[in-house]
């Protein structure tokens, strides 16, 4: 299952951690996809490491763990974020976070 804070808020110009927690007794995580609405933020592969989309590369830092740290937030960053955990042999699990960026 995926456990996450469904609604988070942060100040404009600040930073926020996007985090999903996956728990399973049997399945291992092989890949994690992070998206902002339909736009790719980053992909983590156990075998290949992190790929951060170039459009976000100056503001998105991998971690902690399989989460992302989103920096220099703007009002336009308000919206839905999705984590997709690819696991073996358990299949695919998805989580949703709504981020509200507030004026500082």
């Amino acid at each position: 299952t995926i456990d996450t804070k469904r609604n988070i808020s942060a100040e404009e110009g600040g930073s926020v951690i996007l985090q999903c927690h996956f728990s399973s007794d049997t399945a291992e995580v092989t890949q994690v996809d992070w998206k902002q609405q339909d736009q790719l933020l980053a992909i983590y592969s156990v075998d290949l490491g992190w790929h951060v989309a170039s459009v976000f590369s100056d503001r998105v830092v991998p971690g902690p763990s399989l989460g992302l740290t989103f920096q220099s937030l703007t009002m336009n960053d308000t919206g839905e974020y999705f984590c997709t955990y690819h696991t073996y042999p358990g299949g695919i699990y998805k989580g949703r976070i709504f981020l509200k960026v507030q004026e500082s």
Epitope: T30, D47, G49, H51, V52
Partner: antibody, heavy 119, light 107 residues
Framework: EVQLVESGGGLVQPGRSLRLSCAAS????????MHWVRQAPGKGLEWVSG????????GYADSVKGRFTISRDNAKNSLYLQMNSLRAEDTALYYC????????????WGQGTMVTVSS | DIQLTQSPSSVSASVGDRVTITCRAS??????LAWYQQKPGKAPKLLIY???SLQSGVPSRFSGSGSGTDFTLTISSLQPEDFATYYC?????????FGGGTKVEIK
């Protein structure tokens, strides 16, 4: 014995294509990510591309993105590198390599296959 | 892309010397760093992975340390077979990248 054997290199004109193969033996090929690394004559190592065990995730060096395609056939214990629109700067010895599980360090390398791009 | 800067680019040393090679990453890469040894005409050989884990079969005179952006490979007592070129490689971010290499030569 764990072994990787590359083939398919040769002399090719700029703009043409070449397909490299890597035959794996002595380990369960389908359990591992695989990689291509190249080395231009007298130069250092350059990572070219990597592919996960199930082809679910793939990465490329910026210098080859859009021109090279990595693929694998687990049933044939084989890794491939399709190289299109070749340039003189692609001239190098191409190695395939296998990682230590969960470490991303490359512990088994082939002997390499030489690709020369020249008119 | 992550740039890895190795220093020195070459070092002259004698058998028995302690040799230290550094690798600096342009961004933090946690401990996802490996070290390789390469001799002329041969494929690279993995020495260290995970910044400090010694690969099976590699002599204990080789050791690695560091995390984040600064890493070190140390050869505690240089042996004749250690004269070679050494490369660091990061595997935290795609694309993976190698350092420019350090040639260890006989003084």
């Amino acid at each position: 014995e764990v072994q990787l054997v590359e083939s398919g290199g040769g002399l090719v004109q700029p703009g043409r294509s070449l397909r490299l193969s890597c035959a794996a033996s002595g380990f369960t090929f389908g359990d591992y990510a695989m990689h291509w690394v190249r080395q231009a004559p007298g130069k250092g190592l350059e990572w070219v591309s990597g592919i996960t065990w199930n082809s679910g995730s793939i990465g490329y060096a910026d210098s080859v993105k859009g021109r090279f395609t990595i693929s694998r056939d687990n049933a044939k214990n084989s890794l491939y590198l399709q190289m299109n629109s070749l340039r003189a700067e692609d001239t190098a010895l191409y190695y395939c390599a296998k990682p230590v599980p969960k470490s991303r360090g490359l512990d088994v390398w082939g002997q390499g296959t030489m690709v020369t791009v020249s008119s | 892309d992550i740039q890895l800067t190795q220093s020195p680019s070459s070092v002259s040393a004698s058998v028995g010397d302690r040799v230290t090679i550094t690798c600096r990453a342009s961004q933090g890469i946690s401990s996802w760093l490996a070290w390789y040894q390469q001799k002329p005409g041969k494929a690279p050989k993995l020495l260290i992975y995970g910044a400090s884990s010694l690969q099976s079969g590699v002599p204990s005179r080789f050791s690695g340390s560091g995390s984040g952006t600064d890493f070190t490979l140390t050869i505690s007592s240089l042996q004749p077979e250690d004269f070679a070129t050494y490369y660091c490689q990061q595997a935290f971010y795609l694309p993976w990248t190698f350092g420019g290499g350090t040639k260890v030569e006989i003084k």
